[in-house]
């Protein structure tokens, strides 16, 4: 806290300019009027203030706006944003995407801080849903943003926003998140033709059910092994050898290298060995010929 001292003669600030960088903390406190600061916030970012000085300026704004800053001030905070606490930000009502962009720009190149997370949360809640423009902006600054949301939060993403998602945005998503995103992606891309559709839907397939994988196997998509390995195990298990062969196309040879890893390992255990042998890859571990497979889960469901 800066002591309350009188402003020295001739040092009262008439405008926010570069001369203020030479003011000591107590002089900034005594000589800069908070209302002047608020009206000239757009100048602050261009002036090489230290963070110590920015603390003083923040204190002045806090006194002027104890209930939270107006958006006209927030939009021009610049580096002063880094001095805000999540508690400060929770008092704000940020509605403009331009304001959001301006503040994210300050933190660009750095990991998401608690301040940024709070800002985004306030902004998205204020909008009611994660619209395409917002998602575009957030994933541009933070590619992992989408995967930081809970399945419940992801449910508010409209299908139209899925067009903004790039494959790398989904890199850290877990199956629960992809379960929510996949149906939205399927809806968003439903009017595309086969090959274009597959290119777009590929990143979301970790949430695809068996019936959709079966349908894809009929479309000559040539899924790569990396995508196949991210599929839900429960969705892969019911696929036949013929369906997997069609799904992977020339990439089917990669199964051999992955035969000890899920979902390939579990899928092999469900296939007849003579069916696996038709692939000519030397996959082992299938059901020996002549054995009868009873699906007890199906039997229980029927009784």
């Amino acid at each position: 806290e800066v002591e309350k001292t009188a402003c020295p003669s001739g040092k009262k600030a008439r405008e926010i300019d570069e001369s203020l960088i030479f003011y000591k903390k107590w002089e900034l406190e005594a000589c800069v009027d908070a209302a002047l600061l608020a009206t000239q916030m757009d100048r602050v970012n261009a002036i090489p203030f230290t963070y110590e000085q920015l603390d003083v300026l923040k204190h002045k704004l806090d006194e002027l706006y104890p209930q939270g800053y107006p958006e006209s001030v927030i939009q021009h905070l610049g580096y002063l944003f880094l001095k805000m606490s999540p508690e400060d930000i929770r008092k704000w009502n940020v509605t403009s995407l331009e304001t959001l962009k301006a503040l994210l720009e300050v933190n660009k190149g750095h990991e998401m801080s608690p301040q940024v997370a709070t800002l985004i949360d306030r902004f998205v809640k204020g909008r009611g849903q994660l619209d395409k423009d917002t998602l575009d902006t957030l994933t541009a600054f933070y590619p992992g943003y989408l995967c930081s949301l809970s399945p419940e939060e992801l449910s508010s993403v409209p299908p139209s926003s899925i067009w903004a998602v790039r494959p790398q945005d989904l890199d850290t998503c877990d199956p629960r998140q992809l379960d929510v995103l996949y149906p939205k992606a399927r809806l968003a891309f439903q009017n595309m033709n086969g090959s274009e559709y597959f290119v777009k839907i590929q990143s979301f397939l970790g949430g695809a059910p068996t019936e959709d994988l079966k349908a894809l196997s009929q479309q000559n998509v040539s899924m790569d092994l990396a995508t196949f390995m991210k599929l839900r195990t429960d969705a892969v298990l019911p696929l036949t050898v013929a369906e997997v062969q069609k799904l992977l196309g020339p990439h089917v040879e990669g199964l051999k290298a992955e035969e000890r890893h899920r979902p390939v390992r579990d899928w092999i255990l469900r296939q007849r060995q003579d069916d696996l042998d038709t692939l000519g890859l030397g996959l082992q571990g299938g059901i020996p010929n002549g054995y009868l497979v009873l699906d007890l889960s199906m039997q229980e469901a029927l009784s």
């Epitope: 090489p48 203030f49 230290t50 963070y51 110590e52 580096y79 880094l82 001095k83 190149g109 750095h110």
Partner: nanobody, 115 residues
């Protein structure tokens, strides 16, 4: 984290010249601007000069025309060329960097102007 190490201080006669250096290391990509701050015995610290990442310079009135701040990005070094030194320039000179999200300081180098 940014580390700053000053050098170049010493005893100099009035009217003489000195060049201070400040070697920066660590996360230097996060630096927004750097400056020289001095503290004379029994006085408050005061900003002498600042230089931004794009090379814009600012000087305190008491050193204008005598001191020049510069930086060599290839060597990650900040300089302060001090000419026409006076007795009142005697102080510990600190290098300071404002970098995301705080201010970093060197340990200081003593400049004594005396005959």
């Amino acid at each position: 984290e940014v580390q700053l190490v000053e050098s170049g201080g010493g005893l100099i006669q009035p009217g003489g010249s000195l060049r201070l250096s400040c070697a920066a290391s660590g996360n230097i990509g996060s630096i927004r601007h750097m400056g020289w701050v001095r503290q004379a015995p029994g006085k408050e610290r005061e900003l002498v000069a600042t230089i931004t990442t794009v090379g814009t310079t600012y000087y305190a009135n008491f050193v204008k025309g005598r001191f020049t701040i510069s930086r060599d990005n290839s060597k990650n070094t900040l300089y302060l060329q001090m000419n026409s030194l006076r007795a009142e320039d005697t102080a510990v000179y600190y290098c300071r960097a404002t970098a995301h999200p705080t201010d970093y300081w060197g340990q200081g180098t003593l400049v004594t102007v005396s005959s």
